[in-house]
Interface confidence: low
């Protein structure tokens, strides 16, 4: 999906008002210095690409993020403020339904959400670092 057509300010508002708090809730009890940020982004569309990938694509050791509150709110924000986004996510939704129904917070998931926090901060104010 090409995120360049999204309404960035509306997504930013959604992040600041709710998504950021849900990310903090998920990470509660974890030291902010525990994980190093290894995923980066420069432009806001690039940040959304990385956020979408980390939030909704199951990874080894962390298959359950898509059912978390921050993920559902992220999906809603993208669906509302990125034209045509919903249509591209039909297959992804089917895959999500096949994922485990139980929500398990593994260390790998905590690390992944820590990366997401960094990406969202970059999206909130892109730092235009070297690719």
């Amino acid at each position: 999906y090409d995120f360049t057509n999204c309404d960035f300010e509306k997504i930013k508002a959604a992040y600041l008002s709710t998504i950021s708090k849900d990310l903090i809730t998920y990470m509660s009890g974890t030291k902010s210095t525990e994980f190093n940020n290894t995923v980066s982004c420069s432009n806001r569309p690039h940040c959304l690409t990385e956020i979408q990938s980390l939030t909704f694509n199951p990874t080894a050791g962390c298959a359950s993020l898509a059912k978390e509150m921050f993920a559902m709110k992220t999906k809603a924000a993208l669906a509302i403020w990125c034209p045509g986004y919903s249509e591209t996510q039909i297959n992804a939704t089917q895959a999500m339904k096949k994922a485990r129904k139980s929500k398990v917070t593994t260390n790998k998931c905590l690390e992944q959400v820590s990366q997401l926090q960094g990406l969202w901060r970059r999206f909130n104010r892109p730092l235009l670092k070297q690719q």
């Epitope: 090409d2 360049t4 057509n5 420069s42 432009n43 806001r44 569309p45 104010r125 892109p126 730092l127 235009l128 670092k129 070297q130 690719q131």
Partner: antibody, heavy 117, light 107 residues
Framework: EVQLVQSGAEVKKPGASVKVSCKAS????????MHWVRQAPGQGLEWMGM????????TLIQKFKDRVTLTVDKSTSTAYMELSSLRSEDTAVYYC??????????WGQGTTVTVSS | DIQMTQSPSSLSASVGDRVTITCRAS??????LAWYQQKPGKAPKLLIY???TLAEGVPSRFSGSVSGTDFTLTISSLQPEDFATYYC?????????FGGGTKVEIK
Amino acid sequence: EVQLVQSGAEVKKPGASVKVSCKASGYTFTTYWMHWVRQAPGQGLEWMGMIDPSDSETTLIQKFKDRVTLTVDKSTSTAYMELSSLRSEDTAVYYCARTLDGYYDYWGQGTTVTVSS
Amino acid sequence: DIQMTQSPSSLSASVGDRVTITCRASENIYSYLAWYQQKPGKAPKLLIYFAKTLAEGVPSRFSGSVSGTDFTLTISSLQPEDFATYYCQHHYGTPWTFGGGTKVEIK
């Protein structure tokens, strides 16, 4: 209304330094990066570098790393570009431009720097 | 560094003509390309960003498109105020680079 107002034209001798200012208004100064672009007479646009006004982090292209200093004064929402060891090929119009995603939605009016002995 | 090759370097056209300017990136920059218009003695003015998004206040006769690493700026019906120099610029990451410019002159 967003505005970037640059300092006036300068005439300098080779070897001297010049400091160009760019005063921002109409937006939150620390939210946007400030970039500097120059244009030699009759030539195209050349990106020089950028500064993050929130923490003064700078990125400069290799050819300017030794001679350009980018600074900001947050209290006055002003960005500065200082170019040292001036030579004749530095004669150009210098622009400041703000950006969030890498494209420039607002530019300063330009400052002409003439290097002549 | 990413090189931006812009063509033609100049062109002559008449009012009402359809004008096309192209820019080729030396590597994949996705949609991270902007177009600017510059008139003599003035700062450049943003026309298009993210390859095809029209900047605020820019007339709809300007449009942008992308195919792989090839980018196109089209002016559907050239107006007297459109005679100027046009630059492309990638905004994929540092260092930002500009195309060499295309001067649109009156035929």
